[in-house]
């Protein structure tokens, strides 16, 4: 299954949008920093099957669009630059979902990655028990907008090996 | 675990329309679809719709096109289903039904309903 | 669009015994897609099999889905008192999305 274009563009959107939601310098909130452990070897250039890393990425999309749609997130950052983030979010997740779809006969894919699944999870549960333990503090969201960012960057960078091996 | 509470019995004439609301509580996310699903006296379930509430964006069923409106608040999250021009097939036990965050993939998860409210009777009648 | 054909219409038979009911659609379906509910009289649906044959939370495991392609089945090794109810088998496609049930099938007490 071949993404589309738009697909990419979206990616850098959302990008571009977590970059602005910004509110704070993140050098006001050293004392805040936080190691998520980030599921990099879910991430890794291993033997996935397409069906497998769609799945990993989809998780990934899906669980970020939780993290920023719930009532905190709406309180803490610019509501304007959160629909649009979800806009591309839902977009990605068609996509992707769509891919499966076609894909669905060929692969057996949804449930065979249950661990990398998981992995994904639980990295989104750490960021969630930190925003709460930080009472979703402005500092602590400045260090989730920073994280979200590094790891979307790097679930892109899949995306893109995925689309070099077609 | 989701919470869904329906607004209460409704009796219609012909012609009219009627608005049914859903308020989600508990484990909610405004980014999964709540859908309405109907149930005429006797017979089986039939999909009408869903909507995003994160978006707002919509999807219907064929059947309903023209007819149907879905629309969402995002705090508290509430869905209300309107359906205009209401005919005597339209009496039904209308339901609204969400999927559960917990089901891995999360691509699964949106693939079924996991929660349902309690149903509200919408009774079409002259 | 995707048609739902559930059989038998009813099934009539004794606690203890065994249970098969079965969905047939009408173009292939994942297996991952095909979902079963149980309804029991004036209350609302509830999920039962996943993904074709994963449980529910909660699900007893004398409940089990199988099949794939177009014939899909809900297996109830030893039928409960509180089995008794209607089952209705729904897959789902996309994009756009379409959720569509069957028509259900009864299992009442003989």
């Known amino acids: 299954c071949d993404l589309p274009q738009t697909h990419s563009l979206g990616n850098r959107r959302a990008l571009i949008l977590l970059a602005q939601m910004r509110r704070i310098s993140p050098f006001s909130c050293l004392k805040d920093r936080h190691d998520f452990e980030f599921p990099q070897e879910e991430f890794d250039d291993k033997q996935f099957q397409k069906a497998q890393a769609i799945s990993v990425l989809h998780e990934m999309i899906q669980q970020t669009f939780n993290l920023f749609s719930t009532k905190d997130s709406s309180a803490a950052l610019d509501e304007t630059l959160l629909d649009e983030f979800y806009i591309e979010l839902d977009q990605q997740l068609n996509d992707l979902e769509s891919c499966v779809m076609q894909e669905v006969g060929v692969i057996e894919s949804p449930l065979m990655y249950e661990d990398s699944i998981l992995a994904v999870r639980k990295y989104f549960q750490r960021i969630t028990l930190y925003l709460t333990e930080k009472k979703y503090s402005s500092c602590a969201w400045e260090v989730v907008r920073a994280e979200i960012m590094r790891s979307f960057s790097l679930s892109i960078n899949l995306q893109k090996r995925l689309k070099s091996k077609e | 675990e989701v919470q869904l509470l329906e607004s209460g019995a409704e009796v219609k004439r012909p012609g009219s329309s009627v608005r049914v609301s859903c308020r989600a509580s508990g484990d909610t996310f405004s980014s999964y679809p709540i859908s309405w699903v109907r149930q005429a006296p006797g017979q089986g379930l039939e999909w009408m719709g869903r909507?995003?509430?994160?978006?707002?964006?919509?999807n219907y069923a064929q059947n309903f096109r023209g007819r149907i409106t879905i629309t969402a608040d995002k705090s508290p999250l509430t869905a209300y289903l309107e359906l205009s021009s209401l005919r005597f097939e339209d009496t039904a036990v209308y339901y609204c039904?969400?999927?559960?965050?917990?089901?891995?993939?999360?691509?699964?998860?949106?693939?079924?309903?996991?929660?349902w409210g309690q149903g509200s009777l919408v009774t079409v009648s002259s | 669009e995707i048609v739902l054909t559930q059989s038998p219409g009813t099934l009539s038979l004794s606690p203890g015994e065994g249970a098969t009911l079965s969905c047939r659609a009408s173009q292939n379906v994942s297996r991952h897609y095909l979902t079963w509910y149980q309804q029991k009289p004036g209350q609302s649906p509830r999920l039962l099999i996943y993904g074709g044959s994963s449980r529910a939370t909660g699900v007893p495991d004398r409940f089990s889905g199988g099949g794939s392609g177009t014939d899909f089945t809900l297996t109830i090794s030893r039928l409960e008192p509180e089995d008794f109810a209607v089952f209705y088998c729904q897959s789902y496609h996309s994009p756009p999305p379409v959720y569509t049930f069957g028509q259900g099938t009864k299992v009442e007490i003989k």
């Open positions: 039904a969400s999927p559960s965050a917990d089901i891995i993939p999360s691509i699964l998860g949106t693939t079924l309903f996991a929660f």
């Open positions: 909507i995003l509430p994160a978006l707002g964006v919509t």
